[in-house]
């Protein structure tokens, strides 16, 4: 009994049929970040909750040391939201004085690390200039897309400034992936 | 004939094989909101179009009284976008006068209600400070992630201020979920 | 052997079982845009990379002439992010002078074209007023949702101002769809 007996006859079947419930999946939620060393030309990676509350990993999708480990090759939907919060910086004052300047910014990157590759691959980036008029500001950056990943690939979320990440609620800052 | 005969032998199958087309799915679109009473410590819930235009519910996923009803336990991808629009608030004027203040904000929450639980669970939150310089402003907040839901769970979208929701177009403000 | 033998007995099966790996899928990434003519009452459409880097199309999902072609009827998750960048416009200056005005804005629309329909259908819209205080600004708009599409439908991404699209990195601006 072959998988393609259930597929339209004009279509090539690349994978055996399988139950959806056994596909690798993970949803990770925010924890308070602690300062760490990171590679010189790379934003720092966030670490995550993987068991408590809304967080889970299942079907061989594991979380270890800031990375989601891809247990099986295939097409995955990968997503993250990071909520940032901060105080107004000099930025708006300099601008009010009429001098042009490089804007302050907040950036989220979902990065793929493949051990056989020397350089990480940036899968998704959300980047936003921040020059708020008021005293406190907060805002989310959301990312999500589909990628062809290989068994053994590792995914992480990097941010431009770890101290601005809102760690207070699991629904504000999160990271997930699932095999399609 | 067991489901796992089609799955890689090293992997546990948690669910029988099933046709993708029969999975519970819904995409709901915005309608003009009418003011209603809401629980004291909870943002008001939006109500939705579930049949006309781009909106649909299928395969036992039903919409009733502001809630999407989950007909079957499993992992769901849940998403929403809410487009807000408003006029400049006090906020920027107060700031121009040099007095610091808490910023105005816009917030979207996707909430899960489980009848056996006394408290709703906030699955996703997008929250943003709003202190626009100009007269009119508008902007979307997008959310989406995967959650393990149980049969009988109910999902709703809550917003901080129902009167700021842009109800004019079905592509601007929407809410959906589908079983993975 | 019928598909529904694997599905819960209370549930109607609408499609035959099929391998997930053979479903139509695409992830397209940004390229530098060239100015082109576009329909009078429609925002210009972006064109995309479909083979190099992170971009791919598979299983009869094809890209041609700014359009993703839907090869098979079904429910698709469709997404896009466009990162915009620009300089401060008249907007903030006019406002500083105290005269109210319509805000500048950035807009992304995911549009469906059906040959048998005279008018395109807007599936998703993200629109945001832009009145930045500083000299340079940049920000993403993300969209994603599920739609019931028909074989032969065509999808495109339209933007309000093609010259503001950040084409510099494949992770900043992208467009994708996959059959659920």
């Amino acid at each position: 009994l072959k998988g393609q007996e259930f597929a339209p006859s004009h279509q090539q079947v690349y994978a055996p049929l399988r139950a959806d419930g056994d596909k690798p999946r993970a949803h990770l939620t925010v924890v308070r970040q602690t300062p760490t060393q990171h590679l010189k030309n790379q934003f720092p990676a966030l670490h995550w909750e993987h068991e408590l509350g809304l967080a889970f990993t299942k079907n061989r999708m594991n979380y270890t040391n800031k990375f989601l480990l891809i247990p099986e090759s295939g097409d995955y939907f990968v997503y993250s939201q990071v909520t940032f919060r901060g105080m107004t910086s000099e930025c708006s004052e300099i601008r009010q004085a009429g001098r042009p300047n490089k804007p302050d910014s907040i950036t989220v990157v979902i990065t793929k690390v493949t051990d056989s590759y020397p350089e990480p691959t940036q899968l998704l980036m959300g980047t936003k200039s921040v020059c708020e008029v008021g005293s406190n500001w907060f805002q989310p950056i959301y990312l999500g897309a589909m990628f062809s990943l290989q068994e053994g690939d590792k995914l992480m979320v990097n941010v431009s400034d770890i101290s601005l990440v809102d760690y207070t609620k699991e629904d504000k800052t999160f990271f997930g992936a699932f095999l399609l | 004939l067991k489901g796992q005969e089609f799955a890689p032998s090293h992997q546990q199958v948690y669910a029988p094989l099933r046709a993708d087309g029969d999975k519970p799915r819904a995409h709901l679109t915005v309608v003009r909101q009418t003011p209603t009473q809401h629980l004291k410590n909870q943002f008001p819930a939006l109500h939705w179009e579930h049949e006309l235009g781009l909106a649909f519910t299928k395969n036992r996923m039903n919409y009733t009284n502001k809630f999407l009803l989950i007909p079957e336990s499993g992992d769901y991808f849940v998403y929403s976008q809410v487009t807000f629009r408003g006029m400049t608030s006090e906020c920027s004027e107060i700031r121009q006068a040099g007095r610091p203040n808490k910023p105005d904000s816009i917030t979207v929450v996707i909430t899960k209600v489980t009848d056996s639980y006394p408290e709703p669970t906030q699955l996703l939150m997008g929250t943003k400070s709003v202190c626009e310089v100009g007269s009119n402003w508008f902007q979307p907040i997008y959310l989406g992630a995967m959650f393990s839901l149980q049969e009988g769970d109910k999902l709703m979208v809550n917003v901080s201020d129902i009167s700021l929701v842009d109800y004019t177009k079905e592509d601007k403000t929407f809410f959906g979920a589908f079983l993975l | 052997l019928k598909g529904q033998e694997f599905a819960p007995s209370h549930q109607q099966v609408y499609a035959p079982l099929r391998a997930d790996g053979d479903k139509p899928r695409a992830h397209l990434t940004v390229v530098r845009q060239t100015p082109t003519q576009h329909l009078k009452n429609q925002f210009p459409a972006l064109h995309w990379e479909h083979e190099l880097g992170l971009a791919f199309t598979k299983n009869r999902m094809n890209y041609t002439n700014k359009f993703l072609l839907i090869p098979e009827s079904g429910d698709y998750f469709v997404y896009s992010q466009v990162t915009f960048r620009g300089m401060t416009s008249e907007c903030s200056e006019i406002r500083q002078a105290g005269r109210p005005n319509k805000p500048d804005s950035i807009t992304v629309v995911i549009t469906k074209v059906t040959d048998s329909y005279p008018e395109p259908t807007q599936l998703l819209m993200g629109t945001k007023s832009v009145c930045e205080v500083g000299s340079n600004w940049f920000q993403p708009i993300y969209l994603g949702a599920m739609f019931s599409l028909q074989e032969g439908d065509k999808l495109m991404v339209n933007v309000s101002d093609i010259s503001l699209v950040d084409y510099t990195k494949e992770d900043k601006t992208f467009f994708g769809a996959f059959l659920l």
Epitope: R32, Q33, T34, P35, T36, Q37, H38, F43, P44, R85, G86, M87, T88, S89, E90, C91, D104, S105, I106, S135, N136, V159, S160, D161, I162, S163, L164, V165, D166, Y167, T168 | P100, K102 | -
Partner: antibody
Framework: QIQLKESGPGLVAPSQSLSITCTVS????????VDWVRQSPGKGLEWLGV???????NYNSALKSRLSISKDNSKSQVFLKMNSLQSDDSAIYYC??????????WGQGTSVTVSS | DIQMTQTTSSLSASLGDRVTISCRAS??????LNWYQQKPDGTVKLLIY???RLHSGVPSRFSGSGSGTDYSLTISNLEQEDIATYFC?????????FGSGTKLEIK
């Protein structure tokens, strides 16, 4: 291991400037904020300002006109400069690293006396 | 600026006691309330952040509670090494502000 260490002049003459350096290890200044706090017998703990990972700064408005915070990411150093010191600026000056709302790790402090 | 008030400037307790130190903000600080411990040698450590969350490495006998403007730090079982001054700090709005401190002594 996260460490912060302040080094300052100890003694500063009235109306002169104060310069203190905070040298950090165990984390990268490019992606983490550093606050300055001082403690004087008369005023308790007083927050002076912060420099964020991206380089933006915030100052206590009461001191803003004579305070400047800068950094050198490559040397893992943050600099506090304060002008026109008076006797009530005598205090222990601390640098601390933290999230947007709290100071997670503190240096041991450096004592500054303003006196002629 | 937001004023932070610790009404008790010093407190005497016996080893093993349950000790509570209070702090009041002049306006709602949305749970952005932190507690620090300063030892006699001047060393400062974060104990509790965001009202009730224990910083890494802090013993579980420390706990925090409160909301709005009223907050408290509790030490459930006082130990010798807890002899220190405790400061509250609001992290909701700039400038960050501290309470004047509560000095804890052994009876």
């Amino acid at each position: 291991q996260i460490q912060l260490k302040e080094s300052g002049p100890g003694l500063v003459a009235p109306s002169q400037s104060l310069s203190i350096t905070c040298t950090v290890s165990g984390f990268s200044l490019s992606s983490y904020g550093v606050d300055w706090v001082r403690q004087s017998p008369g005023k308790g703990l007083e927050w002076l300002g912060v420099i964020w990972g991206f380089g933006g700064t915030n100052y206590n408005s009461a001191l803003k006109s004579r305070l400047s915070i800068s950094k050198d990411n490559s040397k893992s150093q943050v600099f506090l400069k304060m002008n026109s010191l008076q006797s009530d600026d005598s205090a222990i000056y601390y640098c601390a690293s933290g999230n947007f709302d709290a100071m997670d790790y503190w240096g041991q402090g450096t004592s500054v006396t303003v006196s002629s | 600026d937001i004023q932070m008030t610790q009404t008790t400037s010093s407190l005497s307790a016996s080893l093993g006691d349950r000790v509570t130190i209070s702090c009041r903000a002049s306006q709602d600080i949305s749970n952005y309330l932190n507690w620090y411990q300063q030892k006699p040698d001047g060393t400062v450590k974060l104990l509790i952040y965001y009202t009730s969350r224990l910083h890494s490495g802090v013993p579980s006998r420390f706990s925090g509670s409160g909301s709005g403007t009223d907050y408290s730090l509790t030490i459930s079982n006082l130990e010798q090494e807890d002899i220190a001054t405790y400061f509250c700090q609001q992290g909701n709005t700039l400038p960050f502000t501290f309470g004047s401190g509560t000095k804890l002594e052994i009876k």
